[in-house]
């Protein structure tokens, strides 16, 4: 005979645990239903009645299946110098991130504790890895045959134009200059930009030092030695 499907609340078999989306109520000594995300336990279960769930009130949320008596409060509204990337709903907390051009250099439980400006790669260097919400830009020297003549947190190294006759050879920070005859191939005018980073939740890791104009925040452990400031070009 197939086993009977137990409906909550039910007493679990000795040594067994409650099923998925159920919890063991110590008072009733029964397996009872959890409340779904966006809800909380309004009335706890008894031996004869299951958990009564209710929706979270405005500005409160539960993200997981739960049996909490009250929903959690959403964080305070994002300040004018932050961007709300996730609104407060019944199922998720508000998330505030750094303003455009900045990244979160130091995270806290919910959101960001310290924003820092995205590193700008100086002429002769291009973006090797774009910045994200939680990591800085990584710059790299422009390889032979490529250049960047901007100070930018988005521009990559781009190829020198190829000339029939070169007037001035290109270098890492300057494009080649052709004689009055037109080049055989030329890049479209204007700098090449990397797209702005999409929202990511990756853990911030310190990039390798690269030249820049925006000094990054360097972190030390309490008694550790002080490394040189990352990628700083000074004043």
């Amino acid at each position: 005979l197939p086993a009977q499907v137990a409906f909550t609340p039910y007493a679990p078999e000795p040594g067994s645990t409650c099923r998925l989306r159920e919890y063991y109520d110590q008072t009733a000594q029964m397996c009872c239903s959890k409340c779904s995300p966006g809800q909380h336990a309004k009335v706890f279960c008894t031996k004869t009645s299951d958990t009564v769930c209710d929706s979270c009130e405005d500005s409160t949320y539960t993200q997981l299946w739960n049996w909490v008596p009250e929903c959690l409060s959403c964080g305070s509204r994002c300040s004018s110098d932050q961007v709300e990337t996730q609104a407060c709903t019944r199922e998720q907390n508000r998330i505030c991130t750094c303003r455009p051009g900045w990244y979160c250099a130091l995270s806290k439980q919910e959101g960001c504790r310290l924003c820092a400006p995205l590193r700008k790669c100086r002429p002769g260097f291009g973006v090797a890895r774009p910045g994200t919400e939680t990591s800085d830009v990584v710059c790299k020297p422009c390889a032979p045959g490529t250049f960047s003549n901007t100070t930018s947190s988005t521009d990559i190294c781009r190829p020198h134009q190829i000339c029939n006759v070169v007037a001035i050879p290109g270098n890492a920070s300057m494009d080649a200059v052709c004689t009055s005859t037109s080049p055989t191939r030329s890049m479209a005018p204007g700098a090449v930009h990397l797209p702005q980073p999409v929202s990511t939740r990756s853990q911030h890791t310190q990039p390798t030092p690269e030249p820049s104009t925006a000094p990054s925040t360097s972190f030390l452990l309490p008694m550790g030695p002080s490394p040189p400031a990352e990628g700083s070009t000074g004043d």
Epitope: C98, K108, L114, P117, A214, T217, S218, L220, P222
Partner: antibody, heavy 119, light 107 residues
Framework: KVQLQQSGAELVKPGASVKLSCKAS????????IHWVKQRSGQGLEWIGW????????NYNEKFKDKATLTADKSSSTVYMELTRLTSEDSAVYFC????????????WGQGTTLTVSS | DIVMTQSHKFMSTSVGDRVSITCKAS??????VAWYQQKPGQSPKLLIY???TRHTGVPDRFTGSGSGTDYTLTISSVQAEDLALYYC?????????FGGGTKLEIQ
């Protein structure tokens, strides 16, 4: 209400060390960054560094990294700054300060601790 | 390090006057500039951040403006209680630096 209470005035001899304290209240201690700022008599303000009790991260102004050491005692919600090998140049008022948001402009300041280095 | 220069150490004004205190950064700080007021024997008080955002409780006679490397704090109608030292500070990147201060004196 956020409050930063600093320890009292100190008179110390050249070459000695001193430990200043900044006790925070009115918020979750591990969620705020505490900064230290120096002000010499009749002069401007200099940022020394910050301590983040949430993860024990520290950041020093290069100019002060051999002078100041920042630590904290989470049980008493207090951040400390130890200054070593004191000279008359270290005579100043030292403020602790913090900021509510993730950008470093200081909404909250301690009352300041006057340090006098004199023989 | 970014150097913040307040060219006027002292400024003399009269009650009711409009006064502007200037601050120049040694490099572009992307409007990440704050202004503080400090009275004798007191801690500095935040007035303005992000160049032009007034801090809670700051009277609207205080306004900030600027971009790039040049920033200004303006008091539209000076009051006797505005006699104080005023500091600019960039909150762009470490090390965070302050201007040398401008002392506002009432004639």
């Amino acid at each position: 209400k956020v409050q930063l209470q600093q320890s009292g005035a100190e008179l110390v001899k050249p070459g000695a060390s001193v430990k200043l304290s900044c006790k925070a209240s009115g918020y979750t201690f591990t969620e705020s960054i505490i900064h230290w700022v120096k002000q010499r008599s009749g002069q401007g303000l200099e940022w020394i560094g910050w301590f983040y009790p949430g993860s024990d991260n520290i950041n020093y102004n290069e100019k002060f990294k051999d002078k100041a050491t920042l630590t904290a005692d989470k049980s008493s919600s207090t951040v400390y700054m130890e200054l070593t090998r004191l000279t008359s140049e270290d005579s100043a008022v030292y403020f602790c300060a913090s900021h509510e948001g993730p950008y470093v402009y200081f909404d909250y300041w301690g009352q300041g601790t006057t340090l006098t280095v004199s023989s | 390090d970014i150097v913040m220069t307040q060219s006027h150490k002292f400024m003399s004004t009269s009650v009711g006057d409009r006064v502007s205190i200037t601050c120049k950064a040694s490099q572009d700080v992307s409007t990440a500039v704050a202004w503080y007021q400090q009275k004798p024997g007191q801690s500095p008080k935040l007035l303005i951040y992000w160049t032009s955002t007034r801090h809670t409780g700051v009277p609207d006679r205080f306004t900030g403006s600027g971009s790039g490397t040049d920033y200004t704090l303006t008091i539209s109608s000076v009051q006797a209680e505005d006699l104080a030292l005023y500091y600019c500070q960039h909150h762009y990147s470490t090390p965070y630096t302050f201007g040398g201060g401008t002392k506002l004196e009432i004639q």
